[in-house]
Interface confidence: low
């Protein structure tokens, strides 16, 4: 008969609010009290089978004891009521689980969307975590009709897609109810015409057509989504060159009404562009569609927009009355070539008499010229036409170049090698910058670039290496020929020398020694040698250091001790550090020359 519980706990299945207080009561049955000879004083409360201190108990009467929890912070508490029976044995009376959580907060930010061809979906912010099973119900009605509730699924509690088809041009009222064991709340109601919540499908079949007449335009055509029959559309058209990562946008006012084509202007010739388009309700109420699939198109070619950079070199060994001249030019970058360059046309004129036309596929031309003054012109040709001509005066053999640039400087900055100068007073047509790596092992093979006559500062455009000495030459070019060149040495980035100087003795006396060394080869300098340090010592003595200017190649050590072995070495320093050379030993004589013991 004692198989049924000895008592019960009230409340039976409590759900309580987190951080609130809670009281449970255990009531013993008479037959149980009689059987075990106990009363409520014998009740022991436990949470998770750990005894709750007696201070939390209240004996209500002989059959009932209560326990109070303050500020409940656990989500689940296993609470048992037990009695101490014969010999202090514990007998379980009853157990419950206290579930705690929070009432739902009012759902906020309720919004709805009608994806074209689909049913309306609404979503909201549910607020704080309640730790309890909380049901969210989307409710909707017309003024004259109540729609079926939309119950949010447990795995997506913040959205719901309605079951009924969307009707446009009739206002609907929508709200959300949230309910759990601790309460029920309702969101604010929203009232709208679903036509203002439409997200159209993106335009499709986007295609791009170029124009032979105009190299700066491309025409786009597309098919509008079906929703066009219900609402008027506006568009967002974006484009970029094929290798760019950022998009440009057509001004919104140009695409603010329903259409199925658009001509994009002010594009670069012979350039591949990528386009995409999206659309929305013309008045801006609703949602933008997703982007269409991208479509590519290439603008038509235009004649080259600039003359190539143009320069020359004269072979120093020339036959009597003639000289060999190498004309050279740079390929135009794509944004100036405006198409595929087919060939170059060079003309050479001696004084005023027309001399020769050349059509060249390369970027250089070697010609034999007399010692007279010549004018050379160069044009680049593509499918559409020729560039403007680059004009170069090759002066006569006896021409004396003057008017160099002044205050020439070169310095590294932002991982580039910059060159600047003061412009001559005379009118400069252009500047030619030449540079090459100085090396003891290889000849100085120059690269070059051309700058406009208004420029007085630029950086070298080439693949420059660190720790290499660059010889940079700037030549101003005037109407009658080149001015005097000016040169300067520079490093993109210095490093300590790869090797230190090798020191030797030139003359050794009783109390002094003349040391000498060779300048370091340019290939191992790795920077400008700013100074040397000579370190010398005896076997038992401290080392002495002497700084020497980098222009010197010898130095006299004085106040040395006679008949003594000295060890000497030298270090060379750039702006980035130094490097020691090998150690050298010498011995001072016991007597000076002519001196006897």
């Amino acid at each position: 008969e004692l198989l049924d519980p000895c008592g019960y706990i009230s409340p039976e299945s409590p759900v309580v609010q987190l951080h609130s207080n809670f009281t449970a009561v255990c009531v013993l049955k008479e037959k149980c009290m009689d059987y075990f000879h106990v009363n409520a004083n014998y009740i022991v409360w436990k949470t998770n089978h750990f005894t709750i201190p007696k201070e939390q108990y209240t004996i209500i009467n002989r059959t009932a004891s209560s326990v109070t929890f303050t500020d409940i912070s656990s989500l689940n508490i296993q609470l048992t009521c037990n009695i101490l029976t014969f010999g202090q044995l514990e007998q379980n009376v009853y157990g419950i689980t206290i579930i705690s959580g929070l009432p739902p907060e009012k759902p906020k930010n309720l919004s709805c969307i009608v994806n074209e061809g689909k049913k309306m979906r609404c979503e909201w912010n549910r607020g704080r975590e309640t730790h309890l099973e909380t049901n969210f119900t989307l409710k909707s009605e017309w003024a004259t009709h109540k729609f079926a509730d939309c119950k949010a699924k447990r795995d997506t509690p913040t959205s719901c897609t309605v079951d009924y088809s969307t009707v446009y041009f009739v206002n609907i009222e929508v709200w959300v109810e949230a309910e759990n064991a601790l309460g029920k709340v309702t969101s604010d109601h929203i009232n709208f015409d679903p036509v203002y919540k439409v997200k159209p499908n993106p335009p499709h079949n986007l295609s791009v057509i170029n124009s032979e007449e105009l190299s700066s335009i491309l025409k786009l055509t597309w098919t509008n989504p079906s929703i066009k029959s219900v609402i008027r559309l506006k568009y967002n058209i974006q484009y970029r060159t094929k290798d760019a990562s950022t998009w440009s946008q057509i001004p919104p006012e140009d695409t603010a009404s329903t259409r199925s084509s658009f001509t994009v202007q002010d594009l670069k010739p012979f350039t591949e562009y990528v386009f995409r388009i999206c659309c929305m309700k013309e008045d801006g109420k609703g949602y933008w569609s997703d982007w269409s699939e991208e479509a590519n198109g290439i603008t038509y070619e235009d004649r080259p927009s600039k003359a190539p950079s143009f320069w020359y070199k004269i072979d120093p060994s020339h036959a009597q009355g003639y000289r060999t001249v190498q004309l050279m030019w740079k390929t135009l970058p794509p944004f100036e070539a405006n198409g595929k360059i087919l060939d170059y046309e060079v003309t050479l004129t001696r004084w005023k008499s027309h001399l020769q036309n050349y059509t060249v596929n390369d970027t250089k031309l070697t010609v034999n010229l007399t010692n007279d003054r010549y004018v050379a012109t160069l044009t680049a040709r593509n499918l559409v036409g020729k560039s403007d001509a680059a004009v170069l005066t090759i002066p006569a053999c006896d021409f004396q170049a003057t008017h160099p640039v002044m205050d020439l400087k070169a310095f590294p900055k932002d991982n580039m090698l910059w060159v600047e100068w003061t412009t001559p007073r005379e009118s400069v047509k252009k500047y030619i910058l030449e540079w090459c790596v100085l090396s003891d092992k290889a000849p100085c093979i120059a690269d070059w670039q051309q700058e406009d006559g208004t420029v007085h500062r630029t950086h070298l455009r080439g693949n420059l290496a660190e720790s290499k000495c660059y010889l940079i030459t700037v030549t101003p070019v005037y109407a009658d020929g080149p001015g005097s060149p000016e040169s300067i040495k520079a490093y993109l980035k210095q490093a300590p020398p790869s090797k230190g100087p090798t020191v030797r003795t030139k003359k050794v006396g009783k109390n002094e020694a003349v040391l000498e060394w060779d300048q370091l080869p340019v290939d191992v300098q790795n920077g400008f040698i700013r100074n040397y340090t000579i370190f010398y010592r005896t076997i038992i003595g401290n080392e002495t250091a002497v700084n020497v200017d980098s222009s010197h190649t010898e130095y006299t050590l004085s106040s040395l001790t006679s008949d003594t072995l000295y060890m000497v070495r030298m270090a060379a320093y750039t702006d980035e550090g130094g490097k020691d050379g090998p150690e050298f030993t010498f011995t001072t004589p016991k007597f000076a020359q002519g001196e006897i013991e």
């Epitope: 089978h49 750990f50 201190p53 939390q56 500020d71 656990s74």
Partner: antibody, heavy 120, light 108 residues
Framework: QLQLQESGPGLVKPSETLSLICTVS??????????WGWIRQPPGKGLEWIGN???????YYNPSLKSRVTISVDTSKNQFSLKLSFVTAADTAVYHC????????????WGQGTMVTVSS | DIQMTQSPSSLSASVGDRVTITCRAS??????LNWYQQKPGKAPKLLIY???SLQSGVPSRFSGSGSGTDFTLTISSLQPEDFATYYC??????????FGQGTRLEIK
């Protein structure tokens, strides 16, 4: 938020009494829902429960240590303490104080521990 | 006293693995079992209480199950910060509170 910090000597001689204090900050030691406990961990070994104390002074000890252990509370300072008498080298351990949540039935917040070495 | 036995005493695993540690009680302890994680030189940290309830702030890749005498801690997809020693502890028959001997989880 609630934090626990152990303090006391790091070296105790054999047969003497080990004394540690745990200071509770960010909450009251008198709170209804919690016990305050001591747990120790000998070097390279597992965890051993020493005892628990309720804010009012009720205590529960590990039977294996009961004869040597005293845990007491000073509510005015929000501290509780451990005394372990007649120590031997076997009592060398990291001693942790911790909060026992009676709702969840677990040590939910721990002090970082203090190393006590028993050596002459 | 109730004895708690963990297995294995150590195991090696790789990041992304699913790992299971078991704990056996010498008698039925209902669902009164907790799991802790301890990293070298640090205090233990409560992961799971009452066999399957996730402690606040603990990642959801940790889960606990079991009742009676056999219990399991599962890490669904091991992360680099999960390499540590794990202890089970019973709170059914107290005092004394008893812990398992620990399971050391190492990088393979």
């Amino acid at each position: 938020q609630l934090q626990l910090q152990e303090s006391g000597p790091g070296l105790v001689k054999p047969s003497e009494t080990l004394s540690l204090i745990c200071t509770v900050s960010g909450g009251s030691i008198s709170s209804n829902n919690y016990y305050w406990g001591w747990i120790r961990q000998p070097p390279g070994k597992g965890l051993e429960w020493i005892g628990n104390l309720y804010g009012s002074g009720s205590t529960y000890y590990n039977p294996s240590l009961k004869s040597r252990v005293t845990i007491s509370v000073d509510t005015s300072k929000n501290q509780f303490s451990l005394k372990l008498s007649f120590v031997t080298a076997a009592d060398t351990a990291v001693y942790h104080c911790a909060r026992w949540d009676t709702n969840g039935g677990a040590f939910d917040i721990w002090g970082q521990g203090t190393m006590v070495t028993v050596s002459s | 006293d109730i004895q708690m036995t963990q297995s294995p005493s150590s195991l090696s695993a790789s990041v992304g693995d699913r790992v299971t540690i078991t704990c056996r009680a010498s008698q039925s302890i209902s669902s009164y079992l907790n799991w802790y994680q301890q990293k070298p030189g640090k205090a233990p940290k409560l992961l799971i209480y009452a066999a399957s309830s996730l402690q606040s702030g603990v990642p959801s890749r940790f889960s606990g199950s079991g009742s009676g005498t056999d219990f399991t801690l599962t890490i669904s997809s091991l992360q680099p910060e999960d390499f540590a020693t794990y202890y089970c502890q019973q709170s059914y028959s107290t005092p004394p509170i008893t812990f398992g001997q620990g399971t050391r989880l190492e990088i393979k």
